[in-house]
């Protein structure tokens, strides 16, 4: 009875050895495996078993040449040949690699399937075991982040379109009670690209919407600001002295009304004062204090509280000037000193005036949001690397390159 159990164990091990070696030399892996391709060139395709047993997944199964030879001699695939001295193996020259034409690539694509829903701690062996009864699988690619963490999704290449279709159409597939999302690889990328595109469109529309809302708020605030300033404008005009300046106006109204802004340039014959309170009151107080005769540098002046459309236009201009002044101040990153046009408005706080823009990488949430490697629609100047990590190589070669096609 125990012997029977041992036989079963041995048969299972041999099947795994065959499967692993046939994967290494198979249609899918071999064209992508730099190291193995180099080895094949050296001796008419023969690769010493000494080298083969350094491949991690085979190494984990056995390092015994006899076991490997025995296993391969029983293989029904008849892909591999064993040298007479039983120390080397090669892919049978009667089974050459298919020519990698567009037609062949298309065929592979059409039998490639995306499966999502595996726990991120699932191993390749777990997945292989799950796929065991699901059709003939040529390659399993565990999709990983740049930091090599498994994402919980895989690409599987079946041996035929029929077996891929059969798998995809099997309802209610689960991995340990977890529902899976199963799509042909092509359709997965279509879904992902659609998601990306939609989210981009949404983000743009949203930004536009927020911009419009912001603009409306600003306009509302401006209107409110205008309303608050109604009746606060005082126009002055006359044959003014060329040396008349803003300071004269501040002195004249110093105790009668707080001046927010003066629209006046030296040498002009008229200007406008914006008071915090009603202009009429400030003018009245100033007149009273000056016996009814309010002059600038001993020159007669006509004083007029603005109203109606004239007032609105003047207010708009003042608000624009204030904004312009504020922007200038911001860009210079320091306080103005009362120079330039109309600038006795209180300046904003003491910020350094620096604006930092931080680069922002957009991530699309749904599905594989952290899809650093991505075929189709790769962004940026460099086409992103294939998601082909966990390459099987002799240990000595492993840190040097990750050139394989999958995780088998």
């Amino acid at each position: 009875m125990a012997e029977n159990g041992d036989n079963e164990k041995m048969a299972a091990l041999e099947a795994k050895i065959c499967h692993q070696i046939e994967y290494y030399f198979g249609d899918f892996n071999l064209p992508r495996d730099k190291f193995l391709k180099e080895q094949i060139k050296l001796d008419e395709g023969w690769v010493p078993l000494e080298i083969m047993i350094k491949f991690n997944r085979l190494n984990r199964l056995t390092t015994d040449f006899n076991v490997i030879v025995e296993a391969l001699s029983k293989s029904k695939a008849e892909l591999m040949e064993i040298s007479e001295d039983k120390t080397k193996i090669r892919r049978s020259p009667s089974k050459p690699l298919p020519e990698v034409t567009d037609e062949y690539k298309n065929d592979v694509k059409n039998r490639s399937v995306y499966i999502k829903g595996f726990p991120t701690d699932a191993t390749l062996d777990d997945i292989k075991e799950w796929l065991e009864d699901k059709g003939q699988v040529l390659n399993i690619q565990m999709r990983r982040t740049l930091h090599k963490a498994f994402k919980g999704s895989i690409f599987v290449v079946f041996d035929s379109i029929e077996s891929a279709k059969k798998f995809v159409e099997t309802p209610g597939q689960k991995y340990k009670e977890t529902d899976l999302l199963i799509l042909f690889k092509d359709d997965y990328f279509a879904k992902k690209n659609e998601e990306r595109k939609q989210n981009k469109v949404e983000a743009k529309l949203r930004a536009k919407q927020e911009q419009e809302a912001k603009q409306k708020l600003e306009e509302d605030a401006e209107m409110k600001s205008l309303e608050e300033k109604i009746g606060c404008l005082l126009k002055f005009s006359g044959d003014l002295d060329d040396q008349t300046c803003r300071e004269d106006l501040h002195i004249l109204f110093s105790n009668h009304g707080e001046i927010k802004w003066i629209d006046f340039v030296r040498g002009a014959k008229e200007g406008i004062i914006l008071f915090k309170e009603k202009a009429k009151e400030a003018l009245g107080k100033a007149k009273d204090a000056n016996n009814g005769n309010l002059q600038l540098r001993n020159k007669e002046v006509t004083w007029e509280v603005l109203e109606g459309e004239v007032e609105k236009e003047a207010l708009k201009k003042i608000i624009e000037d204030q904004q312009e002044s504020l922007n200038k101040w911001k860009s210079k990153g320091r306080r103005f000193k009362g120079k330039g046009k109309g600038n006795k408005a209180a300046q904003p706080g003491s910020g350094k005036g620096k604006v930092q823009f931080q680069g922002k990488k957009t991530k699309f949430a749904s599905d594989d949001e952290h899809d650093e490697h991505d075929e189709n629609g790769a962004t940026g100047p460099v086409k992103r690397a294939r998601e082909e990590t966990d390459k099987e190589e002799p240990a000595s070669k492993q840190q040097k390159t990750e050139n394989g096609a999958g995780d088998q």
Epitope: D179, D186, N193
Partner: antibody
Amino acid sequence: QVQLQQSGAELARPGASVKLSCKASGYSLTNYGISWVKQRTGQGLEWIGEIYRGSGNSYYNEKFKGKASLTADKSSSTAYMQLSSLTSEDSAVYFCARGGLSFAYWGQGTLVTVSA
Amino acid sequence: QIVLTQSPAIMSASPGEKVTMTCSASSSVTYMHWYQQKSGTSPKRWIYDTSKLASGVPARFSGSGSGTSYSLTISTMEAEDAATYYCQQWISNPPTFGGGTKLEIK
């Protein structure tokens, strides 16, 4: 601007079949999925299936296999859904919708009434 | 398939009131999407990827949640918010919708 334009209302006899259409416009992707969603009067939404314009592959909700058949005409960017062996249970509004993993765009819906 | 259960099925709120509706999944999902549907019209994507507002959706709406529990909140109810809201997941085929929450104005 993505738009999904669906065909007009259908009145059919029990046992008959109807074929609804959904024309997509305003999109640059060559391969994308069009889903079909059923809504009975005063009821919720049920996903019937999805067909991909580029690959021609279709995916079905098990519940609607044998009832709905999805096809697509690549050249006219039109998706079709044929409903067969109609019963009163099939009386509903059928929407086509587009999206990644959510449905950002919807057709206006086609009302199917099954009545003897 | 994943079953989504929405509660309450029907609710009413006064203008200005805060409204919260929930969506519970029979197993864990990564993201939840929400749709608004008014009588006689197509559903509109309202919130996607759990918390992102679709364009045109007022900022008073928000979405949150993780795992099996998700919610949609309106900070201050307005008359135009009266509609039926559906949650939806697509973590696996078939994608499924919740039964809907009908929100009425008091």
